[in-house]
């Protein structure tokens, strides 16, 4: 930003342009640049008790530029301001201050919060969520068949994440218990939601087939476990015939 900084030249008289350096059009030994070459900005820098004129390609931090017909001039922003549009309107505050409507503040006003990235006071943003999606089918261990009591879930999306002081988001999924009329799993039916069923490690001599839920594939040798399974299934068939209700859902 401080390109073409004007260097003071000794033995120069005011309003003499020969020998001026660093963008000065006219300069003096005592005051440095008095005027600048075209398109450069004139700024007065305080050095001790005296002010030195300097010519720059753009105004330094803490100053704003005005392009008058006869001079491009840098004017100081307010003390707490790093970049400004004019004396009244700051656009970037110095470290430790927060920008709010053109002013630099120590703390943000009530109802606003400090954004420590932009160093501005911003509106507090509360979480916003969508409407609930429909309930999922009733499942148990990822299956939609071969059981009577399972669970169903529904989800909603976060539409707006909250800011630091904003209200936190409510839960985005909800699960409840559900009761359905037992339905036999058809041959090869998994009823799974993508996931593979966990396979039990077979004992010695057992088939590596996964244990079927109903009339599934069976190994030639029937294990005690498989026999027990068959008996359970027969019992379930009888219970199912006795049941009249089809699908009762209750939230717990």
């Amino acid at each position: 930003q401080n390109a073409s900084r004007g260097r003071r030249q000794r033995r120069m008289h005011p309003n003499v342009s020969q020998g001026c350096q660093g963008g000065c059009a006219t300069c003096s030994d005592y005051n440095g640049c008095l005027s600048c070459k075209p398109r450069l900005f004139f700024v007065l820098e305080r050095i001790g008790m005296k002010q030195i004129g300097v010519c720059l390609s753009s105004c330094p931090s803490g100053y704003y530029g005005t392009r008058y017909p006869d001079i491009n001039k840098c004017t100081k922003c307010k003390a707490d301001c790093d970049t400004c549009f004019n004396k009244n309107f700051c656009t970037k505050c110095k470290s430790g201050f927060y920008l709010h409507l053109g002013k630099c503040l120590d703390n943000c006003p009530e109802g606003l919060e400090a954004n420590n990235h932009t160093m501005e006071c911003v509106n507090i943003v509360h979480c916003e969520v969508s409407e609930w999606n429909p309930w999922s089918p009733c499942t148990k261990k990822g299956k939609t068949c071969g059981f009577k009591r399972g669970t169903e879930t529904r989800v909603r999306e976060i539409m707006q994440h909250p800011s630091a002081k904003g209200n936190l988001c409510p839960p985005t999924n909800e699960t409840r218990k559900c009761t359905v009329q037992r339905k036999k799993c058809q041959k090869g039916e998994r009823g799974k939601k993508g996931r593979e069923r966990k396979r039990k490690k077979p004992n010695k001599g057992e088939s590596k087939e996964a244990i079927p839920d109903s009339k599934g594939l069976e190994s030639s040798k029937e294990t005690p476990e498989q026999r027990e399974n068959k008996q359970q299934q027969k019992k379930r068939k009888v219970q199912d015939k006795q049941q009249k209700s089809v699908s009762v859902s209750t939230v717990h």
Partner: antibody
Framework: EVQLVESGGGVVQPGRSLRLSCAAS????????MAWVRQAPGKGLEWVAT????????YYRDSVKGRFTISRDNSKNTLYLQMNSLRAEDTAVYYC?????????WGQGTMVTVSS | DIQMTQSPSSLSASVGDRVTITCLAS??????LVWYQQKPGKAPKLLIY???RLQDGVPSRFSGSGFGTDFTLTISSLQPEDFATYYC?????????FGQGTKLEIK
């Protein structure tokens, strides 16, 4: 509270003179460039002249150069516009305004009518 | 001088409408653009400076955007008090110049 109050407007014949004043309060007058902006009836805004904060430099629109003179008295917090050789096309509401790149503060305006 | 061209010159809209006014500069003015609102018989009031920054007290339904030569003023949901004339002004260099104004009227 910032206040700019214009006075001196009125009806004047072409070729005659008028002097407008603007009394400022509620801000540091001597820190600001000051300007006159005018608005002809039913028309848009038109910048007329600006004087820098210390009175050392003045700027005018071409159509008023040599006829209008802007001046200020920082000890009295007052801005002036001396208008000579007035023409019919100078008829407008004249606003005084604090001019710091934008026109941040405005007066309520004073009407100048140039008519024979 | 830098010429500022505003469009449209007049606009009819209803309360609740979203309205956009554009301002075109004849040369690059960076973000040195100001918007004013003026009501009949009143002085202009500064709304937006530096192309997009809201002046204190201006409702957030007003917004400004643009850089270089193309700028817009948007009112997201018109309120009865927004019916007025709007002017853009380049603050890039002297001599300061205004757009010709956009009169926003009730439909």
């Amino acid at each position: 509270e910032v206040q700019l109050v214009e006075s001196g407007g009125g009806v004047v014949q072409p070729g005659r003179s008028l002097r407008l004043s603007c009394a400022a309060s509620g801000f540091t007058f001597s820190d600001y460039d000051m300007a006159w902006v005018r608005q002809a009836p039913g028309k848009g805004l038109e910048w007329v002249a600006t004087i820098i904060y210390d009175g050392s430099r003045t700027y005018y629109r071409d159509s008023v150069k040599g006829r209008f003179t802007i001046s200020r008295d920082n000890s009295k917090n007052t801005l002036y516009l001396q208008m000579n050789s007035l023409r019919a096309e100078d008829t407008a509401v004249y606003y005084c305004a604090a001019h710091d790149r934008s026109f941040d503060y405005w007066g309520q305006g004073t009407m100048v009518t140039v008519s024979s | 001088d830098i010429q500022m061209t505003q469009s449209p010159s007049s606009l009819s809209a209803s309360v609740g409408d979203r309205v956009t006014i554009t301002c075109l500069a004849s040369e690059d003015i960076s973000n040195d653009l100001v918007w004013y609102q003026q009501k009949p018989g009143k002085a202009p009031k500064l709304l937006i400076y530096a192309a997009s920054r809201l002046q204190d007290g201006v409702p957030s339904r007003f917004s400004g955007s643009g850089f270089g030569t193309d700028f817009t003023l948007t009112i997201s949901s018109l309120q009865p008090e927004d019916f007025a004339t709007y002017y853009c002004q380049q603050s890039y260099k002297y001599l300061p110049t205004f757009g010709q104004g956009t009169k926003l009227e009730i439909k």
